[in-house]
Every structure is written in C-alpha cells, then in structure tokens.
Interface confidence: low
C-alpha cells in the first residue's frame, strides 16, 4: 500500500494551526453554471474568474456571466462585472491572455443576432480596466496574439475572412478572404491556407498555403495542393496531395516556406492522418496513422532537417484525427516521453523513452507492488499510465500525468500494475527520477498539483461525495498529512494553482448545494508557513540525471551529455521560493554509434549499432529517392542525432555514397525517373 501517516514520516509540526491561519474562503454570489479561471501574467497574483449561467427559455437561451478578479493569488475576489458592462461573455472563446507579462486580456462578448459584428473587451493593465470595442466581423476563433508582439492580433471571421489588428484590437483590417486556417510563425509572420472554389471542406487537398511577413501588405504563395499545414519548432510542415492519386505526403521547410523538401515518411490515404506529437528546434516526433480504422499508427523521429525519419515506435495508440493519444512530454527530465501502444490482443500498454524516441521500453514495475488481478500474464508485469485516452473512455481517472520543468525528475500519474492498462480503479504513482523508477504514492484516484518547484505536493481524493480534506506532502510523496480546510464539505470541481509550479498557494474550487440554491465557492490555502525557512545550500543534494550506476564512465549520458542537478533533499522542509532556478551542471560525453542515426538509404540491423546500406529501396523510401532533393541523396550513412552534443570518441566517417543510382523501379516510367523535383 502507499506510504501514509506512519511513525517514519517526517511530520510537519503544528501544521493545522499554520494552515488554518492561511486558508481563505470566498463564496461567489452566483448561481452555479460554469466557471473558468485564468492567471494574468507570471508572479502577479492576478486571477480572473468568469462564471456563466444559462437559463433555457422557450424561444432563446438567456445567458448571464460575472467576472471576478483577485490580485492575491485567489485569497480575495472582487466582482468587476461592471467593467464589462454586465455583458454576457462567450465561454467557448475563453479569456485570451496575452503572452509573457504583457498584462493583456481579451474577452469576446455574445451579441444579438442582427448585429454587424462582434464585440470584445480589452485590457492591457492586468484586468484593472477594460475597453469595449465593436468588431467589423463576427469572430469564428479566439483572438490570437503574435508571440513576438502582443499588440498584434489575428482572428478568423465566420465568413472565412482573415482579420489583423496592429494596435491590440482597437482597429481591425481584413487582409484576406476565403481563409481556412491561420497561424502565427516567427518574426510576426502569418501562415494561412486559402480555398479557391467552394469551401475549406470542398477544397481540402487543393488549398493554397500563403505567407505574409508584413501583416498583410504583401503575400507569397508558398504551397499548392495543400491538405493541411503545421508549425513545430523551426519546422513548417505541409501535407501535399500527390499528382497521381488521392494520397498525400509531408513536405518540410526550415526557411519559412521559401524552399521545401519531401519528408521521407509514408504517404497517407484519405482516411489517414499525420500528427506532430512534439517538436523543438532540433527535431520532431511525427505520428503517421495506419491504413484502416485501426486506432494506431507509427511514431517517427526526424533528423535535424526534418527530412529523414527513423521509425521510433510501432502500434502507437492514436484514435482518430484530433482524437486521443497518450503521448506526453515529461518536462521534468530531458529526453523523456511516455505514450501508449495498442498491442496485438487490443490491450493498451504504456511505453517510455529516455533518449528522445531512440528506444522505448515498458515502465519498471514499482518496488514491492504486485501484478494486479487483471494481468493475463503474471510473469510480464509493469506499470501502465492512464492519460488522455483513459480520460476520454470515462475511466475513473481525474487527471493526466503531471510534470514540471522546475520540479526536476518528478512525474505523477494514475496507473495500474499489470500487463496492460486496467479498467480497475487506478492508484497514483510518483517517479522522482524522470520515469526510471516508480512508487505508489496514493491509494485510489486523486487530483494533484506541484507547488514550490516540488517542495510541496498537494492532492485531493476524487470522490462523488462532498469533500473537506486536502492532503499534502513535503517529501515528494513519501509521507502525507491531511488538513480539513472547511467544516462544511463541498462538491469539488477542481484544483487550481498558478502555472509553473512556483506558487505556494492552492485554490480548491467547488460548490455548495442547499435545498434552494447552489453557489460557487473557493478555498485558497497558502503553504508559506509550512515551509518556514528559505532553503540553503545544505538542503540540496547532487543528483545525476539518467543515472543507473555512478561508476560507469558513460552513466547518465543521454544525447551526448550528462547533467548533474542540485535537488532539494526529501528530508528538507524549506522554501525553494518563487525565484528558484534549477541548478544544473552539464558535461559532454564521448560519442558512440548510438549518438548517430542512420541517414536515408541506411538502416540498423536489430541489436546492432552500425548503419548498413539498404539492399534495395522500396515503398516510400523509393519515392523519396525518386522525387527528393538530390543533395539529400549523398551521404556517408550517419547523421548526428538532433540535439546530441557528444564530442570525440567514435566518428563514423566513411566514403560518401551517391544513392541516386539506386533510384530505379519497374513501376515508374523512365521519364518520371529522370524528373527530380527540386
């Protein structure tokens, strides 16, 4: 069973009194409808809460919304509905909060049917004041801020117009019509697809991809026969229809669409899809759907150009386009990702990679845990993590896995121990080393959050009954203490803490129900007095990430370097503080063949680290050879793994080969073989 309140636990003294003095209740003078909450800025303490209530009448729906503001992390709220003229705010657009610490907020209002355009309320002072602006169009999407300049906004209209504002929504200009999808790129560039004939749906596969770098003064068509496009890291991807059939292929650009290269990925048919699972400036994880309604596909990882791909994981669970995948970036440790595969017997199993998709393995079974009753094979047993797919299947899983970059090594997730994901009630497990080892942390499903960069973990039991107890741990989930935050239990709806896990405040949201009415209520608990002192140097210990044995000279080497972190000792009860910066010491490793991927036309035989030339090119490899750019066909067989920093050691230099001569096929006419598309 999970560790609990036993004698070994380092208990915090007098915590009830300390927490009672720092528990703040706020009852909202509101009928219960829906509530949405947003933090405005980083470390500002400003929270906006929007409550909406729909009264369905015979002819129309009457809506009412209220806006509340806190500037002390949720301890006190002020009703500021009058600042938005008591207007009903459309919750499907949410609250559009500006990037970084711009203090900008845009709320989109509901307007009556006959109006010429929509209405927004804008604030640039962290929601102290709002300005009402009537729009010359009806918005179809939430306002999108340029990542580089929060004064620049774009939005699509219900008429498929692309509208841009250069002065934070004060004035708007339609820069293009017949637009399907628009996205900000880098340097205030806008990419968008347009249709020529009927509509976005009718022209799917015949769309054009456009770019403007000056907010609509000039345009460049950078792609035709486009099905869709996506941005990931420094890569721009487009799926392009093939000339000869209804399949499509991925093309990639690293220069904002000026030049394109065919990606060495399988083509997909009408019912299939591509999905960028994760991307950074080094590489991309791409999911390619299998033909047929299988619910799975293959993960490929790219080289540094986004052109050559290595198969990373087969039978990757991904239900449909825009459907559910469990793919999770473990942000608390470099190189770690978790996802699910659909095995041959249709059971779902969790896999983890510690080296950015190079190798996947099952999660190690938590120490001293038995395989559960659902395990068909008692000899093969590991931990399986519940994520988006389980949540979509309405399993008793209230939260997806959680990790935070500044809580180094910590991963918290619901899971079960067996040979596959179980439909039984899950428990909560924690890893303190980025997913290598796991321990049962809490019995049964819980909501959980990380505070003070991992110094405190807070949890609330997932229950259909009203609750009034919160659990907290100051030693990364080893020992737990419970605090009764109210005498009168509430129907719990959510835990809220400031994004970034630096805060020491947690807000418990819920509603009270009486015979006549129900009201929203929040309890904000400040843990500052639990962690009485600031952490000092003696509170931190040195930890080598990805370590399996300190005596091994290559121990901890992942992607060519190892990192030593200073981590808070589990026994230290102190504040990391809001200004805490993760201290890490990287050191470069010697190169081995495992630091290189096989370039196009080469492959690794099973259990060998050398790249061997493919005897013949077939399928999508042959297509890439025939139609890919010529400079991508000259290679020595190896490319450094994207982001790999190794130096010295093995340098797999050998003669450069030109693979063009292998681009021959009986199935394609000589004319086609000679026409290389650049």
């Amino acid at each position: 069973s999970a560790p609990g309140e036993d004698e070994e636990c380092g208990r915090v003294r007098d915590f009830v009194a300390k927490l009672a003095n720092n528990t703040h209740q706020h009852v909202f003078d509101d009928l219960r409808g829906s509530v949405s909450l947003s933090w405005v800025g980083d470390s500002t303490g400003v929270i906006l809460v929007l409550t909406t209530f729909h009264v369905p009448l015979v002819i129309m729906t009457f809506g009412q919304s209220k806006l509340y503001r806190s500037e002390d992390y949720g301890k006190n709220f002020k009703d500021i509905t009058d600042l938005i003229n008591n207007t009903f705010i459309r919750t499907e657009f949410g609250m559009a909060i500006g990037p970084e610490n711009s203090g900008k907020v845009v709320l989109t209002a509901e307007v009556s049917g006959g109006s010429r355009g929509g209405r927004i309320f804008r604030s640039s002072d962290f929601a102290k004041n709002f300005v009402q602006t009537d729009l010359p169009f009806h918005p179809l999407t939430q306002m999108m801020y340029s990542p580089q300049n929060s004064d620049y906004l774009l939005a699509l209209s219900t008429e498929n117009g692309l509208w841009v504002s250069k002065n934070f929504g004060g004035k708007w200009e339609e820069i293009h019509k017949a637009v399907c999808l628009a996205k900000w790129g880098s340097d205030n560039t806008i990419f968008f697809t347009t249709y020529a004939n009927g509509s976005c749906k009718a022209d799917l596969g015949a769309l054009e991809l456009w770019r403007t770098s000056d907010l609509g003064k000039s345009f460049k068509t950078i792609g035709v026969k486009i099905y869709s496009f996506g941005l990931g890291g420094r890569f721009l991807f487009a799926s392009v229809m093939a000339d000869k059939d209804t399949t499509r292929r991925i093309h990639v650009s690293t220069d904002q669409g000026d030049t394109w290269s065919m990606a060495q990925l399988p083509s997909v048919g009408q019912e299939q899809f591509y999905s960028i699972l994760a991307a950074n400036d080094d590489m991309v994880f791409m999911h390619v759907d299998e033909p047929g309604d299988t619910g799975f596909g293959t993960i490929f990882t790219s080289d540094d150009r986004g052109i050559v791909y290595s198969k990373s994981l087969d039978r990757h669970l991904y239900t449909t386009t825009g459907g559910e995948t469990d793919f999770t970036n473990v942000t608390s440790l470099r190189g770690v990702y978790i996802t699910s595969v659909l095995s041959e017997d249709n059971s779902i199993q969790t896999m983890i990679t510690f080296d950015q998709g190079g190798r996947w393995t099952h999660l190690r079974k938590p120490e001293n845990s038995e395989c559960d009753a659902t395990a068909k094979n008692k000899n093969e047993c590991s931990l399986h993590i519940h994520a988006s797919y389980s949540i979509s299947q309405k399993l008793n899983v209230p939260m997806a896995p959680l990790s935070e970059p500044n809580a180094v090594g910590i991963v918290i997730a619901h899971g079960s121990v067996g040979d596959a994901i179980s439909v039984m009630v899950p428990d909560v497990y924690i890893s303190d080393d980025g997913g290598y080892s796991w321990t049962k942390m809490l019995e049964g499903p819980h909501y959980y959050t990380i505070l003070d960069s991992g110094g405190i973990i807070v949890a609330i039991e997932h229950s259909s009954r009203p609750i009034n107890v919160i659990k907290f741990s100051t030693d990364e989930g080893q020992c737990w203490q419970t605090y009764t935050f109210t005498r009168d239990p509430i129907y719990f709806t959510g835990l809220a803490s400031e994004p970034g896990a630096r805060s020491m405040n947690i807000s418990i949201w819920g509603f009270t129900e009486s015979f006549l009415t129900s009201q929203w209520v929040s309890y904000t608990i400040d843990f500052k007095d639990i962690l009485e002192r600031n952490c000092e140097e003696k509170d931190y210990t040195i930890w080598l990430a990805h370590s399996t044995d300190p005596e091994d000279y290559e121990d901890g080497c992942i992607l060519g370097y190892k990192e030593q972190f200073l981590r808070l000792a589990k026994s230290s009860v102190c504040q990391n503080g809001r200004d805490y910066v993760v201290t890490k010491q990287p050191s470069i490793c010697l190169c081995s063949l495992e630091d290189f991927l096989c370039d196009f036309g080469y492959y690794r035989p099973e259990n060998d680290s050398k790249c061997v030339e493919q005897p013949e090119l077939k399928g999508h490899d042959l297509e890439f050879c025939l139609y890919g750019r010529e400079e991508h066909l000259t290679t020595n067989g190896y490319r450094k793994i994207p982001g790999d920093k190794c130096q010295g050691g093995v340098n797999p230099v050998r003669e450069v080969k030109d693979l063009k001569k292998k681009c021959t096929s009986n199935f394609l006419s000589p004319e086609k073989q000679n026409s290389k598309s650049n």
């Epitope: 983890i352 510690f354 080296d355 190798r359 393995t361 099952h362 999660l363 190690r364 079974k365 120490e367 001293n368 845990s369 038995e370 395989c371 008692k378 000899n379 093969e380 047993c381 590991s382 121990v417 997913g435 290598y436 990805h546 399996t548 044995d549 005596e551 091994d552 290559e554 121990d555 992942i558 259990n607 060998d608 680290s609």
Partner: antibody, heavy 129, light 107 residues
Framework: QVQLVQSGAEVKKPGASVKVSCKAS????????MSWVRQAPGQGLEWMGI????????SYAQKFQGRVTMTRDTSTSTVYMELSSLRSEDTAVYYC??????????????????????WGQGTTVTVSS | EIVMTQSPATLSVSPGERATLSCRAS??????LAWYQQKPGQAPRLLIY???TRATGIPARFSGSGSGTEFTLTISSLQSEDFAVYYC?????????FGGGTKVEIK
C-alpha cells in the same frame, strides 16, 4: 553476511521433475533479481533464466522454455527452480546467483551490468535410469 | 542470442607472468560484460563487472578492458591461486550468455 544456501543433491529418473531451492540471507530479498545457471560435468556455464522476487516475473532462456519454472516465496526469502521432463543431459550442478540488474529492468539499465555477485554453493542433479 | 567466444581455450603461464584472456561477442554488448573465476568443485566468483570495474575484494592485479564486441581480462602477475577457469558473460540482451571459458594452467 550475504549468503545463498541451496538444497541438497538429487538423483532423478528420466522424465521426472526436480525442484531446487535457494534461500537468501544477509540482504533485502526483494531488492535483487536471482538468476539460475547450470554446469554439466566438464562443461562451461549455461544461463537458464531469471526471476524478480518482487511480483515473481520471470524470463527464461529459449532452450528451457516450457520445461523450467522459477518461483519465489518472499516470506522465507527463497527462490525455487523446477525442471521437468528430465533427460540424461540435464545432469549438472545447478547454481542460483544474485543478479542485481535483471532483464526486466526498464530504462538504460542495459548500459551497465553489475554481474552475478553472490552464488549459491550449487546443487548436483543426476539424471539416470 | 549473442554468442560469446573466448580464446585461447587453454593458456599456459608461469607464476609471476602476465596473462591476457580474450572474449569476443557476436554483436555489440556495450559495456555489459562480466568476468568470473571458477576453481574445481567451487561456484564461480565475480571478478569484473561493467567490462572494467573490479568487484569487491578482487586484487588490483585483475583488470578488464574493452567495449562493444572485444574484451580483455588481464592478470598482471599470476599468483598460484589464480590458476583456474575464467568465463566472460554478457548481459546486453536476454538470454544472458557465457563464453566457453579459458583455462589458465601452470606452465
């Protein structure tokens, strides 16, 4: 000190089964895997399989698949190896050995191997008609 | 499975001399290799793990080197108690496999 004590010598007829025990002491039983290795007279060492005392998961060499069963009893810190359908070529000394790494280990445990650091004294099994 | 080949099968050395034993893997085992010593009527004893790290209590005259497919066990100055059979073993991929052994005998 850390010790693995095995059961005594056995004489079996072809077709029979033998069950050898290995009792661990001096360390936390569930903290290490246990491998079984055999050695036929005048021959080299042959790895048979491995068991994780936590949960009892096993991995067997292909050669012994279907004939070998490894189990454990955590209450007595003992692992067992049962070999069925015995043949004369199964005549050998059977050793249990503490194996800190384990095939089932997740992550890059395969980067580094600690070796079988503690061995039992061996159990002689003779198969003869 | 990975095949481990040891050479020579027998090595005749005089006490005080240096002995070099070789072990080759049929494919890369990285540094997941151990060396054992076995004397007649005794269980094997772990000498080297991780290809090059001496196990607890093993004298400094024993050293291991190599990575990938080629490994060496060196006994710098043979003592009378070192005459025995030596085995290498890989643990890169299941099943674990041993080499056939090298018998070090007195010349």
């Amino acid at each position: 000190q850390v010790q693995l004590v095995q059961s005594g010598a056995e004489v079996k007829k072809p077709g029979a089964s033998v069950k050898v025990s290995c009792k661990a002491s001096g360390y936390t039983f569930t903290s290490r895997y246990m491998s079984w290795v055999r050695q036929a007279p005048g021959q080299g060492l042959e790895w048979m399989g491995i068991i994780n005392p936590v949960g009892g998961s096993t991995s067997y060499a292909q050669k012994f698949q279907g004939r070998v069963t490894m189990t454990r009893d955590t209450s007595t810190s003992t692992v067992y190896m049962e070999l069925s359908s015995l043949r004369s070529e199964d005549t050998a000394v059977y050793y249990c050995a503490r194996d800190p790494s384990g095939i089932a280990a997740a992550g890059p445990a395969s980067r580094y191997y600690y070796g079988m650091d503690v061995w039992g004294q061996g159990t002689t099994v003779t198969v003869s008609s | 499975e990975i095949v481990m080949t040891q050479s020579p099968a027998t090595l005749s050395v005089s006490p005080g001399e240096r002995a070099t034993l070789s072990c080759r893997a049929s494919q890369s085992v990285s540094s997941n290799l151990a060396w054992y010593q076995q004397k007649p009527g005794q269980a094997p004893r772990l000498l080297i793990y991780g290809a090059s790290t001496r196990a607890t209590g093993i004298p400094a005259r024993f050293s291991g080197s190599g990575s990938g497919t080629e490994f060496t066990l060196t006994i710098s100055s043979l003592q009378s108690e070192d005459f025995a059979v030596y085995y290498c073993q890989q643990a890169r991929l299941g099943p674990w496999t041993f080499g056939g052994g090298t018998k070090v005998e007195i010349k």
